[in-house]
């Protein structure tokens, strides 16, 4: 950065090099150039010469004043016009930053994605600070009182192997930057209550031709959790509103969910699951499209998840990883 240049003088900022966005600031430049009584002192911001709000304080020093400074970052340097020099002489430079103190972190959430081996903690950091802001995640065992701290600039993954103090913990987050520090409320967690099952995936769909065509959605998860509740949501692609349906699930076999849908309509489906009775859900699975036929039965699989439709064809394919037996997973 500009701070690495060799200086022939001194540049400083009041109130500070990092300051609150919108403040009035003063930048001072003091020349210390051998055999030079500066005729004039110039200020540059991001390489562009400033023409206004410059005050000469004494023979060697000048001040540049900014009202309501709103730029997150700027490189400042100043130069002197020396009587016997053809070019301006560089005095010194400084990078300045403006921003905000951190908000109180809220919505602290810690989950363990099944098979990940990590506890992932996230939070709402609040408004953008524009300046370097660090977060310290505190994890305190309620059984041993031992506390661990993790430094990060966003979220944190904590190895579950490092959580040796039993099952119950307090988690809180401290946010700090040059302008201030804030601390979240404490979140109490039990490791068994924050596990999110392995992602549920829709593998294929087919519409069976009958008096009333029936669409079957095939979906699965590699979870080993016994009691899992899932939601499937679907809508016609032309609609805004989702239909959300709940399924009691047993992932010892591929799930088959049956729907009576309108003919000749393109639908989109998504699924998500949680350990039954627990707090946290998986994110919704990726969008799965299926167009119901007018009359001809149709199969749609992961291999055909583009915006093209093989109308009139019976497409029968299966995604790898979904080769278990297709028993019906839902009743009623």
């Amino acid at each position: 950065g500009i701070t690495n240049i060799n200086c022939s003088g001194h540049i400083w900022v009041e109130p500070a090099t990092i300051f609150k966005m919108g403040m009035n600031i003063s930048i001072y430049c003091q020349a210390a150039i051998k055999n030079c009584q500066p005729r004039k002192l110039h200020f540059y911001k991001n390489g562009i010469k400033e023409r206004f709000q410059i005050t000469r304080i004494n023979k060697t020093t000048a001040r540049l004043w900014y009202k309501n400074f709103l730029e997150p970052h700027a490189s400042m340097y100043c130069t002197a016009e020396c009587p016997k020099h053809f070019q301006e002489t560089l005095i010194c430079g400084k990078d300045i930053s403006s921003g905000y103190p951190p908000d109180i972190p809220d919505e602290v959430t810690c989950v363990i994605y099944e098979y990940s081996g990590n506890m992932t903690c996230t939070w709402n950091a609040g408004k953008l600070t524009y300046i370097d802001t660090k977060y310290v995640v505190h994890v305190k065992s309620l059984e041993t009182e031992e506390e661990q701290q993790y430094l990060t600039s966003s979220y944190i993954n904590i190895s579950t192997d490092s959580l040796q103090g039993g099952k119950k913990y307090l988690v809180w987050v401290q946010a700090a930057n040059a302008l201030g520090m804030e601390e979240s409320k404490q979140l109490q967690i039990h490791l068994d209550d924050i596990v999110i099952p392995s992602a549920a995936v829709i593998s294929r769909a087919e519409t069976i031709n009958a008096t009333v065509p029936k669409t079957i959605i095939y979906w699965d998860s590699q979870t080993t959790i016994e009691k899992v509740s899932c939601e499937m949501r679907y809508k016609a692609t032309t609609n805004q509103t989702w239909n959300v349906k709940e399924f009691d699930t047993n992932f010892t076999y591929v799930q088959q969910s049956e729907f009576y849908l309108e003919p000749n309509i393109k639908y989109v489906f998504q699924v998500r699951c949680q350990e039954t009775g627990k707090r946290y859900w998986q994110p919704w699975s990726s969008l799965f499209f299926h167009k119901t036929p007018e009359t001809v039965p149709q199969v749609t699989s992961k291999a055909f998840q583009h915006d093209t439709w093989n109308s009139g064809l019976t497409v029968a394919s299966i995604s790898t990883g979904h080769l278990t037996s297709d028993n019906r997973g839902d009743i009623g």
């Epitope: 709940e246 729907f259 009576y260 839902d330 009743i331």
Partner: nanobody, 124 residues
Amino acid sequence: EVQLVESGGGLMQAGDSLRLSCAASGRTSYIYTMAWFRQAPGKEREFVAAIRWSDTTTYYADSVKGRFTASRDNAKNTMYLQMNSLKPMDTAVYYCAVKRDSSTYYRVRNYDYWGQGTQVTVSS
């Protein structure tokens, strides 16, 4: 759309029997499951019984098992709830509901269409 109209409710004595009917009209070919729910004053709506339309498989809440029987008349697009050995705790508004898919039968939120309800009051 499926329209549902319940009938047969009334004021009964404990131990009596009563038959509720639910007549469906409109897109009845889209019925996957038809169910009865009930709601007592100040309480949440709860599952009572359901019948899967395609194969007449029936499901019951534990509180009514052995006393209530769900059946259907396919030709009339009508579902019935035969209620025997009525108890004061059976007092509620009984609602008929339909869903178009194989989602969990006892969840209120899974049902797409609802009737207006019929009042059943059982005095001791």
